[in-house]
């Protein structure tokens, strides 16, 4: 359906709040450099612009798509060179061109200060004195650092901010009434990044056909009631979405997640009967629940998949006929009978389906050459199974701090080169599984815990994308996405490293260390670990863990002292000494 | 949708030859191993002979082993079948069907009668 002005049309449908909310979302996460104030005055200016154009749609440049409006202010910024370098170079170029070229300078670890939160008083007075700006600015300096995040949901997420405010800042306890929800906010936002971070990268990086497979496994999953050509619909509707979210198009993407959660709720009876509560929320809440809503019970006796894709003789008249559907077809059928696989298995199983039909549909006695290809999907089913199985009860035995100590060891062994800090980051990421997925019952681990992985090693690979070091991370990251995870499994110790020269200055610590807080300290110890692995990559985890509980030791000992610095720079010394001499430095 | 096309059918006497052809569309008929199938009145559909897709591999059912031969030609997407020393038993419809699948074509009549 043309409009005349694409502005005014979603002026109109998203309303003016929104609108404001998702162009300051895609002004920032374009420009991640440039200041707050900077950001909402060329919001204001679009906005009085839009205002124009739905009082007439005819007014001058209304007729211009939403690119060229947004990219020709954008361009006006004044420090554009200064501040980004060849990014300025955009804007000599058309659209779509100059679109592509502010995509490709998106940063994914942007050089920008930690968020500090403020005492709760100040942030209480500030909501108070301008509660707009204050919510503006949440908006503002998460979108910056995550220039990925699904907006439509960031309007979520500064709902529930702003509903906490509101009812904390009159609470007796403030702090208690507000710290544990902006910590859940804080913990739920990184999560929520990180997964809208895989699905853009599965776009951009394999194409809209490997979303789409992605997505029927997991649609399937949740709606196992639903028809094929439903959950067909539903792919198709979902992969422009996230399409236009992932390409910056933030007004199309909230706009269309609007028409399918109107779409599901109006048809839930041929999808699911868990969306009655998800449909009774006003918009945003609808929209994250839906998202989020478990999955449906599968119907009772579905037939054997051997019959349709095994047995027929049809088999490759039906591969023929529509490739991708036929696939779509096995994808659907193969996903809503297994809740309890990861949608990351699915995929493999299908991939694994389509290479032996390609391979048999050719032979003169394709059946003979097929008959045994669900044979071939028990190893590629067992491997997560016991990968999982042994992790948990690794998991179990260590704790979550001393798991991820374990995978630190193991993956700065897999790739050294990789900087400290992702290292750390990733690793306490992984770890992370422990308490996220080993807590399930069997059927629901696998899921849990493979999913959640491909997140996080997503950020691996969107990390070292920005300065590659180690090819084995490009290899892995690149060669298949749904085989990363067994990828990354699968590397040993990389011999061709040669250990980092020994720095004192990388293992001297200072009192500071005493007034972090507990998970801070924690990364401190775990980027020393990295460090020695760096320095000494064939340690055993004897000699690791002897060193480690040294420093725990030392660092207890010195914050307990009098005179913490001198402790640490005495004991410190001592400490060096030792490990040097217990890893044979 | 697959489109197959059969040809080539006719009356032929005991002993004559006849030549088939299939035209394949809608389909990438190169990677896709092939089949002839006959159904004669009154009974079951019987599979006749099979290609691979590169045409290193042809079956034959024992029927017609030595009288007919597969081939086909991946540039036109054509499957061929050559019949020779025909029998009034050879008498069916014949079809092209993908893999050893079941017919959706119209396939040819073959009448071999004196």
């Known amino acids: 359906d043309a409009h005349k002005s694409e502005v005014a049309h979603r002026f109109k449908d998203l309303g003016e709040e929104n609108f404001k909310a998702l162009v300051l979302i895609a002004f920032a996460q374009y420009l991640q450099q440039c200041p707050f104030e900077d950001h909402v005055k060329l919001v204001n200016e679009v906005t009085e612009f839009a205002k124009t154009c739905v009082a007439d749609e005819s007014a001058e440049n209304c007729d211009k798509s939403l690119h060229t409006l947004f990219g020709d202010k954008l361009c006006t910024v004044a420090t554009l060179r200064e501040t980004y370098g060849e990014m300025a170079d955009c804007c000599a170029k058309q659209e779509p061109e100059r679109n592509e070229c502010f995509l490709q300078h998106k940063d994914d670890n942007p050089n920008l200060p930690r968020l500090v939160r403020p005492e709760v008083d100040v942030m209480c007075t500030a909501f108070h004195d301008n509660e707009e700006t204050f919510l503006k600015k949440y908006l503002y300096e998460i979108a910056r650092r995550h220039p990925y995040f699904y907006a439509p949901e960031l309007l979520f997420f500064a709902k529930r901010y702003k509903a906490a405010f509101t009812e904390c800042c009159q609470a007796a306890d403030k702090a208690a009434c507000l710290l544990p929800k902006l910590d859940e906010l804080r913990d739920e936002g990184k999560a929520s990044s990180a997964k809208q971070r895989l699905k853009c990268a599965s776009l951009q990086k394999f194409g809209e056909r490997a979303f789409k497979a992605w997505a029927v496994a997991r649609l399937s999953q949740r709606f196992p009631k639903a028809e094929f050509a439903e959950v067909s619909k539903l792919v198709t509707d979902l992969t422009k979405v996230h399409t236009e979210c992932c390409h910056g198009d933030l007004l199309e993407c909230a706009d269309d997640r609007a028409d399918l959660a109107k779409y599901i709720c109006e048809n839930q009876d041929s999808i699911s009967s868990k969306l009655k509560e998800c449909c009774e929320k006003p918009l945003l809440e609808k929209s994250h629940c839906i998202a989020e809503v478990e999955n449906d019970e599968m119907p009772a006796d579905l037939p054997s998949l051997a019959a349709d894709f095994v047995e027929s003789k049809d088999v490759c008249k039906n591969y023929a006929e529509a490739k991708d559907v036929f696939l779509g077809m096995f994808l659907y059928e193969y996903a809503r009978r297994h809740p309890d696989y990861s949608v990351v298995l699915l995929l493999r199983l299908a991939k694994t389906y389509e290479t032996t039909l390609e391979k048999c549909c050719a032979a003169a006695d394709p059946h003979e050459c097929y008959a045994k290809v669900f044979d071939e999907f028990k190893p590629l089913v067992e491997e997560p199974q016991n990968l999982i199985k042994q992790n948990c009860e690794l998991f179990e035995q260590l704790g979550e701090y001393k798991f991820q100590n374990a995978l630190l060891v193991r993956y700065t062994k897999k790739v050294p080169q990789v900087s400290t800090p992702t290292l750390v980051e990733v690793s306490r990421n992984l770890g992370k599984v422990g308490s996220k997925c080993c807590k399930h019952p069997e059927a629901k681990r696998m899921p849990c815990a493979e999913d959640y992985l491909s997140v996080v090693l997503n950020q691996l690979c969107v990390l070292h994308e920005k300065t590659p070091v180690s090819d084995r991370v490009t290899k892995c990251c690149t060669e298949s996405l749904v085989n990363r995870r067994p990828c990354f499994s699968a590397l040993e110790v990389d011999e061709t490293y040669v250990p980092k020269e020994f720095n004192a200055e990388t293992f001297t610590f200072h009192a500071d260390i005493c007034t972090l807080s507990e998970k801070e300290r924690q990364i401190k110890k775990q980027t020393a670990l990295v460090e020695l692995v760096k320095h000494k990559p064939k340690a055993t985890k004897e000699q690791l863990k002897a060193v480690m509980d040294d420093f725990a030791a030392f660092v207890e000992k010195c914050c307990k002292a009098d005179d913490k610095e001198t402790c640490f720079a005495e004991e410190g010394k001592k400490l060096v000494a030792a490990s040097q001499a217990a890893l044979g430095l | 949708a697959v489109q197959l096309v059969e040809s080539g059918g006719g009356l032929v006497q005991p002993g004559g030859s006849l030549r088939l052809t299939c035209t394949a569309s809608q389909f990438t008929f190169r990677s896709f191993g092939m089949s002839w199938v006959r159904q004669a009145p009154g009974k079951d559909q019987e599979w006749v002979s099979a290609?691979?897709?590169?045409?290193?591999?042809?079956n034959y059912a024992d029927s017609v082993k030595g009288r007919f031969t597969i081939s086909r030609d991946n540039a036109k997407k054509m499957l061929y079948l050559e019949m020779n020393s025909l029998k009034p038993e050879d008498t069916a419809v014949y079809y092209c069907?993908?893999?050893?699948?079941?017919?959706s074509s119209p396939g040819t009549q073959v009448t071999v009668s004196s």
């Open positions: 069907v993908i893999g050893r699948g079941s017919p």
């Open positions: 290609i691979s897709a590169d045409s290193s591999t042809k």
